[in-house]
């Protein structure tokens, strides 16, 4: 995977007027890295790993850049003519990447009320917009505004591209960081499912990167997919990830089952704890609970385009 730096800024308007303040998130190699919100923008490292990367650096430069970007985005939202009553959002996502062969990519995307309406390749300065007429009108309007503003302020898009890459390289230089691997903690629990059956759940948490194999084995052989239920791999808020897999087994056969985990070239097997049932709750309820969580994250993906 390429190294990447992604800026995600959102501004809001209510009943025709643009609200002060904005929300900004910066992701480094897909991990939450910096965050800025409300009236006061103070760029803060997200989680211990980000602090480890940048140490006790002052955040003035990040704060200044994000505040400037937020101000520009508020001006763009103020310019949009078709604002109706109610709450509206304008979101800008800017991404730059450095690939293994040292080639680079940069792009910028604009979303209005969660819908993509304008994209630009920052290297070629080529714009793309969707087919729908409403989005196209909005896109033309914003594109022209941005072009005029760029001429006034002598800002060129390739400069955005260069700045983003410069910043990314600076971050990469500053740490052993981003190709780091954090092994998961694996925990196996059991819960009563129905007469004579138990549900066993294997949870892996605190791992990075997100790619992981987690599955149940019976006598060392993988169970078929239709007998296992997996949770999504979700961020746990600490710059690491978590996931789970569950299956239903006959009580008394616990010794035949192990949870197999493989992550970043390392693997481990984890037996089912014997003895009393630890969690007196149907795990299939757990699953609905987890799907609820997943739905929240899916909703966040729609809103934040992550």
């Amino acid at each position: 995977e390429p190294h990447s730096l992604r800026y995600n800024l959102t501004v809001l308007s209510g009943d025709g007027s643009v609200q002060s303040g904005f929300l900004a998130e910066v992701h480094l190699d897909g991990q939450p890295f910096l965050r800025c919100d409300r009236q006061k923008c103070r760029a803060k490292p997200q989680g211990q790993w980000a602090e480890d990367v940048l140490g006790n650096k002052t955040w003035d430069r990040e704060t200044r850049d994000l505040t400037g970007n937020g101000k520009d985005l508020r001006m763009t939202l103020a310019h949009i003519k078709d604002q109706k009553e109610g709450l509206h959002s304008l979101q800008e996502i800017r991404v730059c990447e450095i690939h293994e062969d040292n080639s680079t990519r940069s792009s910028q995307h604009f979303y209005y009320d969660g819908e993509l309406f304008l994209s630009q390749n920052l290297e070629t300065e080529e714009w793309t917009m969707p087919q729908s007429s409403r989005a196209q009108t909005l896109a033309m309007n914003v594109r022209n505004f941005l072009k005029e503003d760029a001429m006034k302020t002598k800002t060129h898009y390739h400069a955005m591209h260069a700045d983003c890459l410069q910043e990314l390289r600076r971050y990469l230089k500053s740490g052993v960081v981003l190709r780091r691997t954090v092994p998961p903690m694996v925990n196996v629990t059991r819960s009563e499912a129905s007469e004579g059956n138990i549900t066993v759940t294997c949870r892996a948490s605190g791992f990075y990167p997100w790619n992981i194999t987690l599955s149940w084995r019976q006598d060392g052989v993988s169970l078929s997919h239709d007998t296992q239920q997996w949770g999504d791999v979700l961020p746990d808020g600490n710059g690491t990830y978590q996931t789970w897999v569950a299956t239903r087994i006959c009580q008394g056969e616990e010794q035949r089952f192990t949870c197999y985990m493989e992550h970043s070239g390392n693997h481990s097997t984890h037996p089912v704890p014997s003895g009393k049932v630890l969690v007196l709750q149907s795990h299939w309820q757990h699953h609905h609970h987890h799907h609820g969580l997943n739905d929240i994250f899916e909703a966040q993906k729609i809103e934040w385009h992550e």
């Epitope: 084995r217 006598d219 060392g220 052989v221 993988s222 078929s224 056969e253 010794q255 035949r256 192990t258 693997h267 481990s268 097997t269 984890h270 037996p271």
Partner: antibody
Framework: QVQLKQSGPELVKPGASVKVSCKAS????????IYWVKQSHGKSLEWIGY????????VQNQKFKGKATLTVDKSSSTAYMHLNSLTSEDSAVYYC???????????WGQGTLVTVSS | DIVLTQSPTTMAASPGEKITITCSAS???????LHWYQQKPGFSPKLLIY???NLASGVPARFSGSGSGTSYSLTIGTMEAEDVATYYC?????????FGSGTKLEIK
Amino acid sequence: QVQLKQSGPELVKPGASVKVSCKASGYAFTKYNIYWVKQSHGKSLEWIGYIDPYNGGTVQNQKFKGKATLTVDKSSSTAYMHLNSLTSEDSAVYYCATTDGYSLFTYWGQGTLVTVSS
Amino acid sequence: DIVLTQSPTTMAASPGEKITITCSASSSISSNYLHWYQQKPGFSPKLLIYRTSNLASGVPARFSGSGSGTSYSLTIGTMEAEDVATYYCQQGSSIPFTFGSGTKLEIK
């Protein structure tokens, strides 16, 4: 490629014990179970037990409990089966096998002939 | 213990002939847990078919497997001289794992 190389034939006296080894190569040893199977002369196959090399956990055929002890040495990627209090009934070829994760006995060792005779 | 009964015990077939070996289980087992092995004289057993109908790596397509519940079978579409061996079914559904008593296949 996956290979299981077993120790050579053993001629032992009744009442003695023997340790059969199975050296694995061509894959990550702790990733897959090692299974042990007995084949008496001209007879069918009998499953003895298996061991998870990662954590040393074993599951055994009740018939062989007290007869066979399964262990591993992770540093040398070798599994061992210790057979004790040997009688003529224990004369057989003993196989180790491992899995690819999809079927039980995917790969087999060449077998170790144990002969119990006075 | 689950007992697997194979039939026939021995059989002789001509090259090109179709062969079917059956394996009957004393209690029902899921098709995911039934496997077939081939053992040629003087050699270790070799996985032939796993999970009832999946051919193991390198096994010729003339071999096939089917069945469910208590009744399973192994078929050789056209017998070849190199297929002379003893064939075993094996269940992994319950502990202890058990094997069939074997079917010895000879050539006419």
